[in-house]
């Protein structure tokens, strides 16, 4: 039975050219996290494996940095980065938990962070 929940940074706005940290946190479960995948739409951005550490997809290595923690830092943002991001927690014995973040990259200098929220 999957009892955990993923808390994410929620809905985020950021400035073009800036950077943003995407973070998820798995709670309410004692399951062991074996790997966390970060995806943008259907593209794999990065993997953090409990044994092997981080792997950044080659096409994103210039703009994606691992961390902090299991999070991911996106740099040199463009308006094309607007969209959904997913943190996919592979755990044992629970299985897979998925969190969702929606990022809007703004042309203006006004960018505010959305509220935190939970995904069951």
């Amino acid at each position: 039975m999957m009892t955990g929940t993923i808390e994410t940074t929620g809905n985020i706005s950021a400035e073009k050219g800036g950077s943003i940290i995407l973070q998820c946190h798995l709670s309410s479960t004692t399951a062991q996290v074996t790997q966390v995948n970060w995806e943008q739409q259907d593209q794999l951005l990065a993997i953090c494996n409990a044994d092997l550490g981080w792997h950044i997809s080659p096409s994103f290595k210039d703009r994606v940095a691992p961390g902090p923690g299991l999070g991911l830092t996106l740099q040199s943002l463009t308006v094309n980065d607007t969209g959904e991001y997913f943190c996919i927690y592979h755990t044992y014995p629970d299985g897979t938990y998925t969190g969702r973040i929606f990022l809007e990259v703004l042309e203006s200098s006004v960018a505010e962070h959305g509220a935190r929220f939970q995904i069951p």
Partner: nanobody
Framework: QVQLVESGGGVVQPGRSLRLSCAAS????????MGWFRQAPGKERESVAA????????YYADSVKGRFTISRDNSKNTLYLQMNSLRAEDTAVYYC??????????????????WGQGTLVTVSS
Amino acid sequence: QVQLVESGGGVVQPGRSLRLSCAASGPSFSSSPMGWFRQAPGKERESVAAISWDGRFTYYADSVKGRFTISRDNSKNTLYLQMNSLRAEDTAVYYCAARDSGSGYYSRAQWYVYWGQGTLVTVSS
């Protein structure tokens, strides 16, 4: 409770166009992110397009980019999918889906709560 009813499906020749509609009943349509999905015979359901509650943000699967357009008319509680340059591989049952609220679009089926019964689109010469 949101109820979704798709229409507009049918048989069409390759290269032609078709417009699907999804009529929604329920008070929360104007705040509902929505999406179109499809399932071809013997294949898994796949995402086609998605749209935010206000239409500001849209998503398209790579296979339909440049050919399909998702839109909505909140005053009519209706979601649309304009399909141009249809191909044989677009043949499938098309479903619309909705959720009660949320920011941006939702491209993955797991986030949707409400589903229509589907409308069949057959692209054949």
